[in-house]
């Protein structure tokens, strides 16, 4: 499995992973105790036919070309969790692993 | 986890799973012995803000709105394998489980 990594100034047109730091305080998400900021990353770019396609299925749908099907799009293909300390709806403090908070790899699907 | 199911005549605009039968013979993929056809399904539709977003990460990127980031797109969020009998590059007959050949659920990511 392979994915491109780019920096925030790159003019790369293909599907790529870009750095993004999420700042919960800046968003006003005051129920999150820690971390206040974390490296989330994001996916952006074009999915030309075949490039970085994660699944054979993507190729098959492209060939079949059914009504309404868009081309593949640049989306996370591998994600990882982070540990967070936060208030739940009952004002209890919770420490837990929140899945799929960090993009580790991007691809076309 | 939740995803919409639609049929091919549906006027649903949101991200939805649609039926699609892939016919290997019609594609000229003669190295596939069996199955000759299978139900692959595909994803199509709009990803309006929040609807069917699989990960909180998607929401966070939307809020951060970094340079070049597109909105979330309708993509498989759950896939399953199928068993296939096929010729490999060395003309050997292989029986194996091929991952991510069927879309079980669609969502916005």
């Amino acid at each position: 499995d392979f994915g491109l990594d780019c920096d925030e100034h790159s003019t790369e047109s293909r599907c790529c992973r870009y750095p993004l730091t999420v700042d919960f305080e800046a968003f006003g998400w005051d129920w999150i105790i820690a971390p206040k900021r974390y490296k989330a990353n994001y996916c952006s770019g074009e999915c030309e036919f075949v490039f970085l396609q994660k699944y054979p299925h993507t190729h098959l749908v492209h060939q079949a070309n059914p009504r309404g099907s868009a081309g593949p799009c640049c989306t996370p293909t591998k994600m990882s969790p982070i540990n967070m300390l936060y208030f739940n709806g009952k004002e209890q403090i919770i420490y837990g692993k929140i899945p799929a908070m960090v993009v580790d790899r991007c691809g076309c699907s | 986890d939740f995803g919409l199911d639609c049929d091919e005549h549906s006027t649903e605009s949101r991200c939805c799973r649609y039926p699609l039968t892939v016919d290997f013979e019609a594609f000229g993929w003669d190295w596939i012995i069996a199955p000759k056809r299978y139900k692959a399904n595909y994803c199509s539709g709009e990803c309006e803000f929040v609807f069917l977003q699989k990960y909180p990460h998607t929401h966070l990127v939307h809020q951060a709105n970094p340079r070049g980031s597109a909105g979330p797109c309708c993509t498989p969020t759950k896939m399953s394998p199928i068993n296939m009998l096929y010729f490999n590059g060395k003309e050997q007959i292989i029986y194996g489980k091929i991952p991510a050949m069927v879309v079980d659920r669609c969502g916005c990511s």
């Epitope: 047109s13 | 340079r67 980031s69």
Partner: antibody
Framework: EVQLLESGGGLIQPGGSLRLSCAAS????????MSWVRQAPGKGLEWVST????????YYADFVKGRFTISRDNSKNTLYLQMNSLRAEDTAVYYC???????????????WGQGTMVTVSS | EIVMTQSPATLSVSPGERATLSCRAS??????LAWFQQKPGQAPRLLIY???TRATGIPARFSGSGSGTEFTLTISSLQSEDFAVYYC?????????FGGGTKVEIK
């Protein structure tokens, strides 16, 4: 023949809005990123904005961010630039330009339109 | 942003002579550099992309060289139609940036 034809320029008061259009022909429009580049009278070239072939990704110069919006209609082979909160310093000839796709990087403009003049003045 | 500096601002050359135009980037742009020619009242025209590759229909007297931060456009034997303003432009990083231009005039 590959052609780009801009329209929509004119005289507008500061704070006003204008929408520029660029009609493309002679190539598969949806396969190419498109950009707007401007040139103030007697000055050099200045990049304004770029949009990917699919329209999914957009990029802006800091001086227009939040004021200008680039978009495209691939079914009409047309590129747009919506310009709001116009200032005197936005006075320029606005060119639309096609990406040459010479490598995987956006930004090498192989075809340019003839330009449309935007004058912001009271 | 990457600042592109062109020199000289004006170059006076006689027809048939060689012209050498320079472009310097404030940081590496690899080979993601283009050269454009612009005549009064006209749109720019792409001459060179990828620092050294001539665009379609561009005469062989135009050549580009360099990579990283130092680039050169050479016109081997100036023709009357070559008197114009020349711009370099980097497309390695956002924002895309142009040099201030070099005016090539008749000596």
């Amino acid at each position: 023949e590959v052609q780009l034809l801009e329209s929509g320029g004119g005289l507008i008061q500061p704070g006003g809005s204008l929408r520029l259009s660029c009609a493309a022909s002679g190539f598969t429009f949806s396969s190419f990123a498109m950009s707007w580049v401007r040139q103030a009278p007697g000055k050099g070239l200045e990049w304004v904005s770029t949009i990917s072939g699919s329209g999914g990704s957009t990029y802006y110069a800091d001086f227009v961010k939040g004021r200008f919006t680039i978009s495209r209609d691939n079914s009409k082979n047309t590129l747009y630039l919506q310009m709001n909160s116009l200032r005197a310093e936005d006075t320029a000839v606005y060119y639309c330009a096609k990406d040459g796709r010479y490598n995987w990087n956006y930004g090498a403009f192989d075809i340019w339109g003839q330009g449309t003049m935007v004058t912001v003045s009271s | 942003e990457i600042v592109m500096t062109q020199s000289p601002a004006t170059l006076s050359v006689s027809p048939g002579e060689r012209a050498t135009l320079s472009c310097r980037a404030s940081q590496s742009v690899r080979s993601n550099l283009a050269w454009f020619q612009q005549k009064p009242g006209q749109a720019p025209r792409l001459l060179i992309y990828g620092a050294s590759t001539r665009a379609t229909g561009i005469p062989a007297r135009f050549s580009g060289s360099g990579s990283g931060t130092e680039f050169t456009l050479t016109i081997s034997s100036l023709q009357s139609e070559d008197f114009a303003v020349y711009y370099c432009q980097q497309y390695n990083n956002w924002p895309l940036t142009f040099g201030g231009g070099t005016k090539v005039e008749i000596k």
